[in-house]
């Protein structure tokens, strides 16, 4: 069992039972809205305490508190007194016997001055309307199944009434610098919760309610940067609730209180429980955690190794429910693999693997132990094995049909999921560092590509699953395919020569025109060459905006790869052909549903790799080769 699991147990707090004989100043303040001079409250609806204050001191035995249920003889309630500094005396009666506390029938109470034989004050109440519940007695707090989630469960001092109470949770970061103040949330019973103490009569909504979809193990959700008051979603039922939207890796304190529901039972909010503290595990995204399977049986997880620290992976399987059946999951060791350090620029990666099941949600935890022995836990987002299928690297084949005109073909790495496989093809001119990326339609098996003649290129292909059945991260790029486009034929050269002669003549003529007749020259220039927009200025903001939508991610791969390329999609030229859906358009639609997307791991960037910040240079290929993609070959 990892040491992280211990914090689930250590943050459990057992509260001491309240001393019911005394009335605290807190009780008095909680009943401040009760205008009756004789105030009464019940902690469990099986007890009753009544009290009133007298300004003037009176001899012992002056007052008597009498009570009677309908048609019964009045009885006296034994009184105790508390001296009130700067005020006088508080008289308190705790009903001596549970038999004397009856719900749902009017209880007549009156205070009598025995010496004067006068009724000082009187009241009729229903014990079921004067609840002042004691706070939940046992509070357990632990991390939920997603980063930033907190699972809280509690026990009621009086379990038989817990169905008729509503709860409020107050919490905040333990470090006050991180917050503007505590957050208070009413715990609303909903169907997406995890009941910790489910009673037999309450119908479980877990099986019929839609559970939140597990997110993809290779995708990073939006990072929470604001350290101030977190917006959080919360679900509750019975003795349990789940808060989400907290800052992973932070420490929180929390308190609970309860109030009669106002439907079956009435009363006031009770006091807050003593604070419980809990440390949330960090988000494994920070470690660049990526998990995948190649065979739908074994799962491999990898993450960046921290300097001067050791790390260990853990996993557990939970059934396809909103919440794990077991409140305290048993984390199993993920079998460690050899550490890899393929390149100097790449951080060292830790890898581990384990056998998985296809009928369960997979939960991953990474524990990092620093040199002083401090253990930091990082939680991955849960996923199904079929959402983490990594394809083998595809093979790319090409042949040149005519000068600069390439016919490309590739084999589907997985024939069983051909229609769910999407590809990315990237190419770059020799000597250039930046890549142009093309996305064929989903399921395409090839296509044609027009490149500049007499040029050298490198082409690479990668694949990923993005269908209704299977999804997963990108495969690694195929080995670079080197292409040298052919020289044009003689007659093309002749045409080129003619073009050159005519071109030179035109340039000379224009220069003469510009020198002799400048106004005519400007008109002619505008007619022949309308001003073209600066593509980088035009596209720059689009690229920056899109980049903001897809935050950069620490991508983990087998080999030291180039920085992720800029995404530039080139559509088929012919308008009569209806192109098949592209991976990226599919992806943008799916992204909102937390489904994997082909854009998921591709940060958009206008800078080539290794460019210094603020020194973005132009993309050479984008400047030279806006050539059409003739067609994509369908299966």
């Amino acid at each position: 069992m990892p040491s992280w699991a211990l914090f689930m147990v250590t943050s459990c707090l057992l509260l001491a039972p309240q001393n019911l004989a005394q009335v605290s100043s807190q009780d008095v303040s909680l009943l401040a809205s009760d205008s009756e001079p004789l105030k009464c409250f019940s902690r469990t609806f099986e007890d009753l305490t009544c009290f009133w204050d007298e300004e003037e001191a009176a001899p012992s035995g002056t007052y008597q508190l009498l009570y009677a249920y309908p048609r019964e003889k009045p009885r006296a309630c034994p009184l105790s007194s508390q001296s009130m500094p700067h005020f006088g005396t508080r008289y308190v009666c705790q009903f001596p016997d549970q038999e004397e506390v009856r719900l749902f029938f009017p209880l007549h109470l009156w205070v009598k001055n025995v010496f004067l034989n006068q009724t000082r004050t009187q009241r009729v109440l229903f014990v079921d309307s004067v609840g002042l519940p004691a706070p939940p007695s046992i509070i357990k707090a632990m991390g939920g199944s997603q980063p930033g989630e907190l699972q809280i469960s509690w026990e009621e001092p009086a379990p038989e009434i817990s169905d008729f109470l509503r709860y409020e949770l107050r919490y905040g970061p333990r470090d006050p610098k991180n917050s503007t103040g505590p957050t208070v949330i009413q715990l609303i019973a909903t169907e997406t919760c995890c009941p910790a103490l489910q009673r037999p009569h309450s119908a479980s909504a877990l099986d019929q309610s839609p559970c939140a979809q597990p997110t993809m193990p290779w995708q990073d959700g939006p990072k929470q940067t604001s350290p101030s008051r977190e917006a959080s979603a919360l679900t509750a039922e019975g003795g349990s609730c789940l808060i989400s939207g907290l800052q992973p890796g932070n420490s929180y304190w929390l308190q609970l209180r309860s109030e009669p529901d106002g439907i079956s039972l009435g009363g006031s909010w009770g006091s807050w429980s003593l604070p419980v503290t809990v440390d949330l595990p960090g988000d494994a995204v920070a470690l660049g955690l990526q998990c995948f399977t190649l065979d739908l049986k074994n799962v491999t997880c990898q993450w960046q190794q921290q300097d001067h620290a050791s790390s260990q992976g853990f996993f557990y399987h939970s059934r396809a429910r909103c919440c794990p059946r077991d409140r305290y999951p048993i984390w199993e060791n993920c079998e460690e693999e050899e550490k890899t350090n393929p390149g100097l620029q790449t951080p060292q990666f830790s890898r581990c693997h384990f056998k998985s099941r296809n009928d369960s949600i997979i939960h991953i935890l990474v524990e990092v132990t620093t040199a002083p022995g401090t253990v930091h836990s990082y939680l991955g987002s849960p996923f199904w094995i079929h959402q983490a299928v990594r394809l083998p690297t595809p093979n790319l084949h090409w042949r040149e049909i005519s000068s600069g005109h390439l016919e490309l073909e590739w084999q589907h790495p997985s024939s069983w999921a051909a229609q769910e496989t999407c590809y990315q093809l990237r190419y770059t001119g020799e000597g250039h560092q930046d890549w142009k990326v093309l996305e064929p339609p989903l399921g395409a098996r090839g296509g044609t590509l027009e490149l500049r003649p007499r040029s050298r290129y490198r082409l690479q292909l990668r694949a990923r699953l993005n269908g209704p059945t299977y999804q997963g991260p990108w495969s690694s790029w195929s080995d670079p395919t080197r292409v040298e486009t052919a020289t044009e034929t003689a007659w093309i050269s002749l045409v080129t020569a003619l073009h050159l002669v005519l071109g030179l003549s035109a340039v000379l003529g224009l220069l003469l025109l510009r020198w002799q007749f400048p106004a005519h020259y400007r008109r002619l220039r505008h007619a022949l060459w309308p001003s073209l927009p600066d593509l980088h200025r035009v596209l720059g903001q689009y690229l920056r905006d899109t980049a903001a939508l897809s935050p950069p991610k620490a991508t983990v791969s087998d080999t030291c790869e180039e920085v992720e390329p800029s995404l530039l999609e080139i559509l088929p030229k012919s308008s009569e052909r209806t192109p098949l859906p592209l991976c990226s358009s599919q992806a943008q639609m799916d992204y909102r549903r937390l489904q994997p997307s082909c854009l998921g791991t591709m940060p958009l960037s206008v800078c080539p790799p290794m460019a210094e910040s603020g020194s973005c240079c132009t993309t050479h290929i984008a400047n030279h080769s806006y050539l059409p993609l003739s067609y994509w070959q369908q299966p």
């Epitope: 249920y69 309908p70 048609r71 038999e99 009856r102 719900l103 749902f104 029938f105 009017p106 007549h108 009241r123 009729v124 229903f126 079921d128 309307s129 038989e160 009434i161 169905d163 008729f164 009673r199 009569h201 079956s264 009435g266």
Partner: antibody, heavy 117, light 107 residues
């Protein structure tokens, strides 16, 4: 959802007896007040009897004291009204109802009792 | 026994009218008073409890006020569904007693 389903009732001769039942479902609280209320044809509502569901307290209207008995069976979650020595003025629709600090919030569908020779 | 006197016994009003029904207890009952609505052949339905608290499921156009001995039920804007008989009931002491009822009719 709390439900009160009534049964019994019917035609009975003066001096005769009849038992009414009220099956309670959906209430899980340890104890709660249950009552019988009646309404003579064309008249107003009249409270008849009440009992705490732990059986410790029973209350009756003066008009039925000594003739009617309210009881409950916790194992069956059922409320009863045993009516003896019935009179013509007992003819009414009888309702069972749950009562507490909020009055009678849940009512049965009613059952007709006719006392006639 | 505590007597509950309701007035008027019959009330004619039009849709959209503001309507008030009063109930007086023969002795002080604090705020332990409920109002019910009953339609022919149906069981009564709780509208107001503890003199002024709106019962679950009751429309917000219904409101109650009063304490001690004098109480009122107000319907802010009469709707077609509101034509029925209304009863007040004290539950401060036993025997529990109802008012004689107010029949609300269409004018």
């Amino acid at each position: 959802q709390v439900q009160l389903v009534q049964s019994g009732g019917g035609l009975v001769r003066p001096g005769g007896s009849l038992s009414l039942s009220c099956a309670v479902s959906g209430i899980t609280l340890r104890t709660y007040g249950m009552h019988w209320v009646r309404q003579a044809p064309g008249k107003g509502l009249e409270w008849v009897a009440g009992i705490s569901f732990d059986g410790r307290s029973e209350y009756y209207a003066d008009s039925v004291q000594g003739r009617f008995t309210i009881s409950r069976d916790s194992s069956k979650n059922t409320l009863y009204l045993q009516m003896n020595s019935l009179r013509a003025e007992d003819t009414a629709v009888y309702y069972c109802a749950r009562g507490a600090h909020y009055g009678f919030d849940i009512w049965g569908q009613g059952t007709m009792v006719t006392v006639s020779s | 026994d505590i007597q509950m006197t309701q007035s008027p016994s019959t009330l004619s009003a039009s849709i959209g009218d503001r309507v008030t029904i009063t109930c007086r207890a023969s002795e002080g009952i604090y705020h332990w008073l409920a109002w019910y609505q009953q339609k022919p052949g149906k069981a009564p339905k709780l509208l107001i409890y503890k003199a002024s608290s709106l019962a679950s499921g009751a429309p917000s156009r219904f409101s109650g006020s009063g304490s001690g001995t004098d109480f009122t039920l107000t319907i802010s804007s009469l709707q077609p569904d509101d034509f029925a008989t209304y009863y007040c009931q004290q539950y401060s002491n036993y025997p529990l007693t109802f008012g004689g009822g107010t029949k609300l009719e269409i004018k």
